[in-house]
Every structure is written in C-alpha cells, then in structure tokens.
C-alpha cells in the first residue's frame, strides 16, 4: 500500500505526524496561543515531547535565526510551579536550562543560548517569536 504523508499548511513543516509553524512576529504568550488557534486544525503553541522532536525543531529554526527566543506551549497557569502543555500533552520530557530565578516568569521559551534545545521561563507579557503545532 502507498501511504500518503499528510500535507501541512503552506509555510509549515512536517515531522513525525505533526505540522509546525514558526512565526517571526512578536506576540506575548497568550496572543501567540490565540494566533496558533486561529490557524485551525486544533493548532496550539507547540508541545515538545522528546529530544528528537526538540532537535528537529531547533535545526529548522536555526536556519532562520539564532538569537531570538521563541514561545512554546508550556506554561504555569496557576503560578504554582506546576508546568503544563497548553495542548494537554503530558509533562514528561523536560529540557530546562539551569535554575529559574523566579519573578513572575510563568511561560516557557526555547532559548537561543543552546541553539533552541533548552527552555527558559520568561514573563508571559514579553513579545517574542512563537512556534505553533498541530496534527494533520
């Protein structure tokens, strides 16, 4: 049987059953999530659930830029240091860089410090690039 690889929306890239859209617009975390949702298909800010997925995303983004942090779908909505993925994925894979020094940093970004392979917490009202994800 010929199995057709699902197609992603124009400008999005495909990896292991998911489509990813990298947006170099500046949005705060919640506006970025709303914009991801607006693209339909059940899209949200991206969950990153394995090193393989992280590496693929990092490689893709590095082709565009290497200095700007990028919002992902991990946040601490109740501000209790109980982080969760906005798309409901389990919080099993973690790739935090170092220790948080607190101060109302309740949203997660891919950090440019380690070629986008590690995450940092930041203030959710910061306006940054963002990464969306959906399953086609």
């Amino acid at each position: 049987d010929i199995i057709m690889r699902p197609s992603c929306a124009p400008g999005w890239f495909y990896h292991k059953s998911n489509c990813y859209g990298y947006f170099r617009k500046l949005r705060n975390w919640s506006d970025a999530e709303l914009e991801c949702q607006s693209y339909g298909n059940g899209a949200h800010l991206a969950s990153i659930l394995s090193l393989k997925e992280a590496s693929t995303i990092a490689e893709y983004i590095s082709g565009y830029q290497r200095s700007q942090p990028i919002w992902i779908g991990l946040h601490d909505p109740q501000k209790r240091q109980q982080w969760q993925w906005i798309d409901g994925a389990m919080y099993l894979y973690r790739s935090w860089s170092g220790k948080s020094m607190g101060g109302n940093k309740h949203c997660a970004e891919m950090s440019s410090n380690n070629n986008f392979l590690t995450w940092s917490s930041n203030e959710c009202n910061k306006r940054q690039h963002f990464l969306c994800k959906y399953r086609p």
Epitope: Q78, Q81, Q84, Y91, W96, M101, N104
Partner: antibody, heavy 122, light 112 residues
Framework: EVKVVASGGILVQPGGSLKLSCTAS????????MSWVRQNPEKRLEWVAE????????HYPDSVKGRFIISRDNDNHILYLQMNSLKSEDTAMYYC???????????????WGQGTSVTVSS | DVLMTQTPLSLSVSLGDQASISCRSS???????????LEWYLQKPGQSPKLLMY???NRFSGVPDRFSGSGSGTDFTLKISRVEAEDLGLYYC?????????FGGGTNLEIK
C-alpha cells in the same frame, strides 16, 4: 541554613484583626512560592493561603477567602498574613511554609517555620 | 474540594516491624500535566511538620530509605519497612494537584 520564622500570634477577640509575619533567611526568597498552613487544637492541618514568587498571584480556600490576605516583601524577605473578621474556628498554630522548587518543578513544602499561635476568643 | 481520608487513625508498632498508612482521595489527584502531587509529612511531638515524600514516591533529601511511597489515582500508601523510635509522631498525606490543596486527617504512629 534555610530559616522561616513566624511571629505576630496573640489572643484576639472574635471579629478582630491580626497580621502575622514570617521572616525568611538562607535562601533566595524571591524565587519561591510561599504558603501559610494552620493546625487547629485537634491537630488537623489546613492550607490557608499561597502566594507566587513574584507576589502577584494568590490562592485561598473558601474558609478564609475574603477575610485573609497573603502578601510578601521580596526586598526584605518577609511573608505576611493579614487576618480580618476572625472567628473562633481560626484558632490554630500558623506555620509559614516554603514550597520546594527548582522554579520548574514543585516538590513539596520543604521548610516549615516553628509556628505562631493565634487564639480567637472573647 | 478533594477529601483526603487516612487510615488507620492510630497505629501501634513494635520497633523493627513494618508500618503501613493508607490515604484515599475522593477523586483522582493526577494533575492535568500527568504528575500526581501527593506528599507525606511527619510531625514529631513538639515539632513542626516535615516533608517526607513528594510526588507519591520520591523521598525528600535526608529521609531514610526505610520510608517508601506508592499508589496512583485515588489510593496511596506510605510504608516504613523497619520502624525506629524516631519515627513516632503524626503522619499526614497531602494533595497539591488541585486547588485548594488538602491534608488527610493524620495517623498517629506509636511505638509498642
């Protein structure tokens, strides 16, 4: 050495107000979620208030909501609990508690102060 | 609110024996992120409570390996494999997955 020292507990009449303080030392206070937990004379524990590291988010159980206010002074490493409209059932030992965390992963209330006793009685 | 029910209320154990304390929640206490924030605390006579276990089965630093935690969903257990004199006191389970966080009523461990 991590220390959290609560103070301010006294005998107060029903309907009265009281402000508890907790002075923290030995850790980066501004990086930790903090709570107040109380223990009544029957030894039952009850979580009564929580505040996030930056001080802008708070949580309370229904039993104290609208009467108690938790706040913090990160510059001076002090946690507060303003208690208003006190009732006899608020009589308890009040503990100041640190939430253990790396910032990315909560792992329990790892340091408890020695407690300060509040008695509400006429 | 999540009701946490501990059994037994009191437990009398000989030194060297095993002790087991049960904690049952009125609903599942897995957080939306998949983690179960279930903790155990010990309050020794005249002292403040101290953290023993977090996230069901993780021992806090300095806690002896004779303490172990297990369970999932709504049923959790704290076991002390070989009870020592210093283990006496009040044991509390605590769920911090759902607001408001809630404690069990406590189990008093006595030495025979």
């Amino acid at each position: 050495e991590v220390k959290v020292v609560a103070s301010g507990g006294i005998l107060v009449q029903p309907g009265g107000s009281l402000k508890l303080s907790c002075t923290a030392s030995g850790f980066t206070f501004r990086s930790y979620v903090m709570s107040w937990v109380r223990q009544n004379p029957e030894k039952r524990l009850e979580w009564v208030a929580e505040i996030n590291d930056g001080g802008s988010y708070t949580h309370y159980p229904d039993s104290v909501k609208g009467r108690f206010i938790i706040s913090r002074d990160n510059d001076n490493h002090i946690l507060y609990l303003q208690m208003n409209s006190l009732k006899s059932e608020d009589t308890a030992m009040y503990y100041c508690v640190r939430h253990g965390s790396t910032g990315y992963d909560y792992f329990g209330m790892d340091y408890w102060g020695q407690g300060t006793s509040v008695t509400v009685s006429s | 609110d999540v009701l946490m029910t501990q059994t037994p209320l009191s437990l009398s154990v000989s030194l060297g024996d095993q002790a087991s304390i049960s904690c049952r929640s009125s609903q599942t206490i897995a957080h939306r992120n998949g983690i179960t924030y279930l903790e155990w605390y010990l309050q020794k006579p005249g002292q403040s409570p101290k953290l023993l276990m977090y996230k069901v089965s993780n021992r806090f630093s300095g806690v002896p390996d004779r303490f172990s935690g297990s369970g999932s969903g709504t049923d959790f257990t704290l076991k002390i494999s070989r009870v020592e004199a210093e283990d006496l006191g009040l044991y509390y389970c605590f769920q911090n997955s759902h607001l408001p966080p809630t404690f069990g009523g406590g189990t008093n461990l006595e030495i025979k």
